[in-house]
């Protein structure tokens, strides 16, 4: 019946040498893609020159395979029934799953100038860093290849730099070769109620990012969740990527290759200005750019990123308040194609399905000593690139998932 | 209130160096740079360059380089200008100046400025 | 590097008069100059910043104008006080460069 359902459940989804979650969770059987769309732009000299908009045209999928690393110094605690890990980082680029190759050029914003102009806000390191931006011969935007922009390359403005500074830059530099954590999460052993919650990252509860429970790790990594999960609960999960703890809410029953998964999703509601959602309010941690905290849509990392003006948002600013986007000609948000959501199976919890959306955007502001930003008249929060994260349960687990678990109960 | 506390007056031999020092009070000393300006009757006020201890950024104008030397030491709130195989023409009233910080005033406050004269 | 010239070298002028001086410099610097007062045995005194910003505590007969390359400095109602050397900077590009100076004498 449906207590040994209930018992043979709980010792399965346990992490613990030996349980199927385990096998699963160590090193995970379903394959995961990334498919990166980078923003191309069209008029970078008439940005340049007359602070016209951006016009942006997306140019994907360019698609990695990512996460087919088992988990490192996966270590178990008995006496807090928590187990310790690190998820190492690597991408193998999948010609085939793609529009091209690594080697595609792109016109985008010079990530250095953008990013130094930042930084170092006082003039007089500015009107250095001018003279460095002109010896280089760099400019407000650049053309890098798609490997260069992903993974990094050595950048000319920053190699003149006569302090140590890194002069290696890329979106996601570095990336291969490392590893996300240390994670360390509840086995469940003890309260299965709590099975994959994460205790602490890089050895501690809170991030320093954020004020007030904005800074709490909430929840699990979203691979997995607690089991016998109902429509009405609220799913917490914590993103590295993201810097932030976030939350899905039930959207729909939907049927995954015959089995029954629920469809959660990242309600816009999470992507709103404290004025629509005071629970908001301490993920607003800058005044002028939120213009009063009253944008949406978009989320100030840079202290995550060590200063960089990191924004992340929705792909194509879906969620977004206008003034976001007013910047930018050549968008189309689709909540279809750019929400994120995750299909659970809710008996064991686990994440059957998910499509991870997010968009990477740089902030460059005017700047009357940095001679290729001067004639700009506004802000801009410039996307770079919207990705979209993928995994769906193998056709053979699939199957065994059908005859273990819901066949079982059916 | 913002102060600059320059060095004293130094009388030095040809070919020697010298060194001056530019003791900053009342602000943060990594939030500024510090510039040091030369000056004297045939050309005037001439930059020289500048420092900024909060991100270790130092510049030079082309025309002093290999001449002056700047630094800064955090720890006493002091910047230094070395100057090097001295000359006739390397006599000057040297100043040590500070912005306003991010409202475009260059040299806002000056230090009372350190007399090199050299001569054997 | 972009060169500034001053002019006039001097200036001699009666007390309540208007006093002009001007600075044009080799490169376009946008409205990035700026205005400074020395006194005998002084270091010199920043009056107005770029953006023709007069400094706070600075008296408002001074005032500057300018755009681009051409820059003037006006006085506009001369006092004994007002004695002094005037030096012109731009401060648009490295190396930052200064004026020859003006000296302003009463008549």
């Known amino acids: 019946g449906d207590m040994l359902i209930q018992k043979t459940i709980k010792k399965e989804v346990v992490l613990e040498e030996g349980t199927i979650a385990f096998k699963n969770w160590v090193k995970t059987g379903t394959e995961i893609y990334r498919q990166f769309w980078i923003f191309d732009v069209q008029n970078p000299q008439e940005v340049m020159m007359n602070s016209s908009n951006i016009q942006v045209k997306q140019r994907g999928p360019y698609t990695y395979r990512v996460r087919f690393l088992a988990k490192e110094n996966i270590t178990q605690d008995p006496k807090d029934n928590t187990v310790s890990f690190l998820q190492p980082n690597g991408a193998i680029f999948e010609p085939s799953l793609s529009v091209g190759t690594e080697a595609d050029n792109f016109t985008v914003l010079n990530l250095a100038v953008a990013a130094a102009s930042h930084i170092y806000p006082n003039p007089f390191v500015q009107v250095v860093l001018n003279s460095l931006i002109n010896k280089s011969k760099s400019s407000m935007f650049q053309v890098r290849t798609l490997r260069e922009l992903l993974w990094g390359y050595t950048d000319p403005f920053l190699s003149l730099v006569p302090y140590p500074v890194s002069t290696r830059v890329g979106m996601f530099y570095p990336y291969n070769n490392t590893a996300d954590g240390v994670y360390k999460v509840f086995n469940g052993k003890d309260s299965i109620s709590k099975v994959a919650i994460i205790d602490t990252y890089k050895g501690k509860r809170n991030l320093s990012y954020w004020e007030s429970y904005c800074d709490m790790i909430n929840g699990t990594d979203a691979a997995s969740f607690p089991p016998f999960v109902e429509k009405s609960q609220v799913l917490q999960f914590f993103s590295s990527d993201i810097c932030r703890s976030i939350y899905a809410v039930f959207e729909s029953d939907v049927n995954l290759k015959g089995i029954p998964v629920y469809r959660f999703v990242l309600p816009s509601k999470a992507f709103a200005s404290p004025v629509q959602n005071p629970d908001n309010h301490c993920f607003c941690t800058e005044k002028i750019i939120s213009k009063n905290c009253t944008s949406y849509g978009v989320l100030d990392i840079s202290k995550c990123k060590e200063g960089k003006p990191v924004y992340i948002s929705l792909p194509h600013f879906l969620y977004a308040s206008p003034d976001v986007s007013e910047t930018i000609d050549g968008l189309n948000p689709n909540e279809e194609e750019h929400r994120t959501y995750l299909d659970i199976e809710p008996i064991t919890g686990f994440t059957l399905q998910f499509a991870k959306r997010l968009q990477v955007n740089l902030l460059v502001k005017p700047s009357n000593k940095i001679q290729v930003l001067k004639r700009l008249k506004r802000n801009y929060i410039v996307p770079i690139l919207w990705l979209n994260e993928t995994g769906t349960i193998g056709d053979e687990k699939a199957k065994m998932f059908r005859s273990q678990v819901t066949g079982k109960i059916n | 209130q913002v102060q600059m506390k320059e060095s004293g007056a130094e009388l030095v031999r040809p070919g020697a160096s010298v060194k001056l020092s530019c003791k900053a009070l009342?602000?943060?000393?990594?939030?500024?740079?510090i510039q040091w300006v030369k000056q004297t009757p045939v050309h005037g006020l001439e930059w020289i360059g500048g420092?900024?201890?909060?991100?270790?950024?130092?510049v030079y104008n082309q025309k002093f380089k290999g001449k002056a030397t700047l630094t800064a030491d955090k720890s006493s709130s002091t910047a230094y200008m070395e100057l090097s195989s001295l000359t006739s023409e390397d006599s000057a009233v040297y100043y040590c100046t500070r912005g306003g910080g991010y409202d475009g005033a260059w040299f806002a406050y000056w230090g009372q400025g350190s007399l090199v004269t050299v001569s054997a | 590097e972009t060169t500034v010239t001053q002019s006039p070298a001097s200036l001699s002028m009666a007390i309540g008069e208007k006093v002009t001086i001007r600075c044009i410099t080799s490169?376009?610097?946008?409205?990035?100059m700026n205005w400074y007062q020395q006194k005998p045995g002084e270091p010199p005194k920043l009056l107005i910043s770029?953006?023709?910003t007069l400094r706070p505590g600075v008296p408002s007969r001074f005032s500057s104008s300018g755009y681009g390359t051409d820059f003037v400095f006006t006085i506009e109602n001369m006092l004994s006080e007002d004695v002094a050397d005037y030096y012109c900077?731009?401060?648009?590009?490295?190396?930052?460069?200064f004026g020859s100076g003006t000296k302003l004498e009463i008549k």
């Open positions: 009342g602000y943060t000393f990594t939030d500024y740079e």
């Open positions: 420092i900024h201890p909060g991100s270790s950024g130092i």
């Open positions: 490169t376009d610097i946008d409205d990035d």
């Open positions: 770029e953006g023709n």
């Open positions: 900077l731009q401060s648009d590009n490295l190396p930052f460069t």
